[in-house]
């Protein structure tokens, strides 16, 4: 069969080889397409409801006034010339539609190095067959699932036209110390060959390099966290980062209902104050960072060091 590629909505003429150029003609077209369940026969004398889709012209050719998705399939003509010689023509018709130029929507203006970022979503509307979307960084193809690159794809089909809408969401983790203004673009490659790719306008987000956070230090006074009943313990959370982050306090893994402060004072220690304390620093551009945990315990008179102690109620400390 001869392969024919036709654009959706355009007319198509299929020649019936060996057919006399003018009536009377002995010929028959047979179609097996999305509009038929088996073979549909069309003859020159035809003329009827199928004319809107396909009709035999006076010269024996089959005319499709506006090719649609349902017209994909096999078209055969059997013709007999004046001398009784039979000729067969066989066509395999495939249809296509080029979408509009793809676009990048919801694009990020800034990316953060070292963490996953959504770059944007590439959208292509009105293709057939579906085709594919691919991303490029500085003109080179980006390979999903490699070097911090991930792509989420979605394909939808219009219920009436049958045309496809493709969406591709790009996530990247920019390397620290890399290009501060990378260029991303997206391209649509048609499902049928011999058609060039369509590329979006590029986007150039800035890459922000976060200053690495030094460890959050928790200093305990008295050292070791062991104190006699009625004594005072001072916990200080030290974070070198600028601007100063918010500091919250945890006891036994549970946040203490206190306003943010870098210093926690536990005056007149009682059994209810025993437990494990830590501080959490929250910076606007980072996730929360927790310090090491320290254990606060009560030394009964005559003992040499921290005891297990019993954990009492939730006595709250005061903040400096």
């Amino acid at each position: 069969a001869q392969n024919i590629t036709a654009r959706i909505g355009e007319p198509l003429v299929l020649k019936c080889k060996g057919a006399p150029k003018k009536p009377p003609q002995r010929l028959e077209w047979k179609l097996n397409t999305g509009r038929t369940e088996a073979w549909k026969v069309l003859s020159p004398q035809g003329g009827g409801p199928w004319d809107s889709v396909a009709r035999v012209l006076p010269n024996g050719s089959l005319f499709l006034p506006a090719v649609g998705i349902q017209d994909e399939g096999i078209f055969r003509c059997q013709a007999m010339n004046r001398n009784g010689k039979e000729t067969k023509s066989n066509y395999r018709v495939r249809v296509y539609q080029i979408p509009g130029k793809p676009e990048i929507v919801d694009s990020a203006s800034e990316l953060t190095a070292g963490v996953p970022n959504k770059v944007g979503t590439c959208v292509s509307e009105g293709s057939y067959p579906a085709g594919t979307l691919s991303w490029h960084l500085d003109g080179k193809p980006l390979v999903p699932n490699e070097k911090g690159v991930s792509v989420k794809e979605q394909t939808r089909r219009h219920p009436e036209t049958g045309l496809f809408t493709l969406q591709s969401e790009l996530m990247v983790t920019p390397a620290r110390g890399g290009d501060p203004r990378p260029t991303f673009s997206c391209s649509f490659s048609p499902g049928l060959p011999r058609h060039r790719a369509l590329r979006t306008a590029p986007i150039q987000p800035r890459v922000w390099e976060p200053v690495p956070l030094e460890e959050v230090q928790l200093v305990v006074e008295p050292e070791g966290g062991a104190v006699a009943p009625g004594g005072t313990v001072t916990l200080t959370c030290e974070v070198p980062a600028q601007p100063s982050p918010q500091i919250h306090w945890m006891k036994d893994g549970v946040p203490l209902p206190l306003p943010p402060s870098p210093v926690l004072i536990l005056p007149e220690i009682g059994p209810q104050d025993q437990g494990t304390y830590s501080c959490v620093a929250t910076h606007s551009s980072h996730g929360p960072q927790e310090s090491r945990a320290v254990s606060i315990s009560i030394i009964e008179p005559g003992e040499e060091g921290p005891t297990a102690g019993s954990v009492g109620g939730s006595g709250l400390g005061t903040l400096a």
Epitope: G48, P49, W50, S52, V53
Partner: antibody, heavy 119, light 107 residues
Amino acid sequence: EVQLVESGGGLVQPGGSLRLSCAASGFTFNNYWMTWVRQAPGKGLEWVASIDNSGDNTYYPDSVKDRFTISRDNAKNSLYLQMNSLRAEDTAVYYCARGGDIRVSLDFWGQGTLVTVSS
Amino acid sequence: DIQMTQSPSSLSASVGDRVTITCRASQDVGIYVNWFQQKPGKAPRRLIYRATNLADGVPSRFSGSRSGTDFTLTISSLQPEDFATYYCLEFDEHPLTFGGGTKVEIK
């Protein structure tokens, strides 16, 4: 909303002529074939004529061929049926309907107009 | 010309009944059969298109099926508003041919 409104029916003598009109709205008229269907009193439905979207091709059953002519004016969103040499058996309610080809077949109908052929 | 033989020509049924109407085409018409409902003094309304597809706004108790050249309209549970006359139509070839109609009456 798709609307089809027929007009032009009435009483006519055998051998006489009548022109029916159908005003279409609510859709892109020139994208669709159009069809006339009739129904004699107490009887079933009978196809009368179809026309393609451009108006270049028309189709009729033998019962009305050479007597009836279907036409359209896409600029006016209007469909017509010119009926000549009318006979008593042409007495019916005439409906205009959208479609008539294999893509869309008679999905919307007008309310009908009555044609009575009698002396 | 294609003949569409519709049966029965009339039937009596009660609300809630399952009703089946058949049209047989005299030759292959593919999937190109519609079903219509008509009430007295009103225009026909398309129920099913291309043999099996439910038209917009038509209740799901109506369904269409095809086996070769036999086409069936089924009303799964007859409602009071379903008492009407039903027609099939082949539109694969000219002349377009309607079935003779089936009048569904209250038992």
